[in-house]
């Protein structure tokens, strides 16, 4: 299969509500009409799939119903949002893009975005 460059930010800080967003951009060598995007988490040399979606160019990304990810596409950019993150989910999140159709098939894997998640401090009890 053919290789393709994928770019993503090096570091992202999740919001206090456990939401992190980043852009995954791929250098499409041709006019792909069908794309598959997968987010993988690498931590302690273990790689696990976070979510995956396919989309037709110009349409919304379709994630599984129980996915913690949402996203939109614009040209060769995919805007990804991961929700429900906790401090223990801190890690390297890697964007993988596959151009499924038309042939030839292209595969690109980003260097990863280090997402830092800080659990919010509980509110102190009020005396009132």
């Amino acid at each position: 299969c053919k290789a393709m460059h994928v770019a993503q930010p090096a570091v992202v800080l999740a919001s206090s509500r456990g939401i992190a967003s980043f852009v995954c951009e791929y250098a499409s060598p041709g006019k792909a009409t069908e794309v598959r995007v997968t987010v993988l988490r690498q931590a302690d040399s273990q790689v696990t799939e976070v979510c995956a979606a396919t989309y037709m160019m110009g349409n919304e990304l379709t994630f599984l119903d129980d996915s913690i990810c949402t996203g939109t596409s614009s040209g060769n950019q995919v805007n990804l949002t991961i929700q429900g993150l906790r401090a223990m989910d801190t890690g390297l999140y890697i964007c993988k893009v596959e151009l499924m159709y038309p042939p030839p098939y292209y595969l690109g894997i980003g260097n990863g975005t280090q997402i830092y998640v800080i659990d919010p401090e509980p509110c102190p009890d009020s005396d009132f």
Partner: nanobody, 119 residues
Framework: EVQLVESGGGVVQPGGSLRLSCAAS????????MGWFRQAPGKEREFVAD????????YYADSVKGRFTISRDKSKNTVYLQMNSLRPEDTALYYC????????????WGQGTLVTVSS
């Protein structure tokens, strides 16, 4: 060294069926994904189908959706491609491929098995 060996190719009439097999040997297998690609003479290599082994989730190219089915047998380290309602345009060399991890890419490839659909 991991080896992928395909079998099951052959000559079949339009509308017929074939079942391709891909057996992995020579290593310890916990592949992230296994898939099938094909290449017709003078054309680019094309994605056909894959299965992500942890969730058993399958994905198909539009051109084969509803006609082809990918499955796996973990105990035999084997992945299958059941091909029904074959068409002349399905004629190609079919390759099995394996992804050791989600970020490795398709590191392992078989030698291919030829499928010819002709009357």
């Amino acid at each position: 060294e991991v080896q992928l060996v395909e079998s099951g190719g052959g000559v079949v009439q339009p509308g017929g069926s074939l079942r391709l097999s891909c057996a992995a040997s020579g290593g310890t297998f916990s592949f992230y994904g296994m898939g099938w690609f094909r290449q017709a003479p003078g054309k680019e290599r094309e994605f056909v189908a894959d299965i992500r082994t942890s969730a058993g989730r399958t994905y198909y190219a539009d051109s084969v959706k509803g006609r082809f089915t990918i499955s796996r047998d973990k105990s035999k380290n084997t992945v299958y491609l059941q091909m029904n309602s074959l068409r002349p345009e399905d004629t190609a060399l079919y390759y099995c491929a394996a992804e050791p991890s989600g970020i490795s890419g398709w590191d392992y490839w078989g030698q291919g098995t030829l499928v010819t659909v002709s009357s």
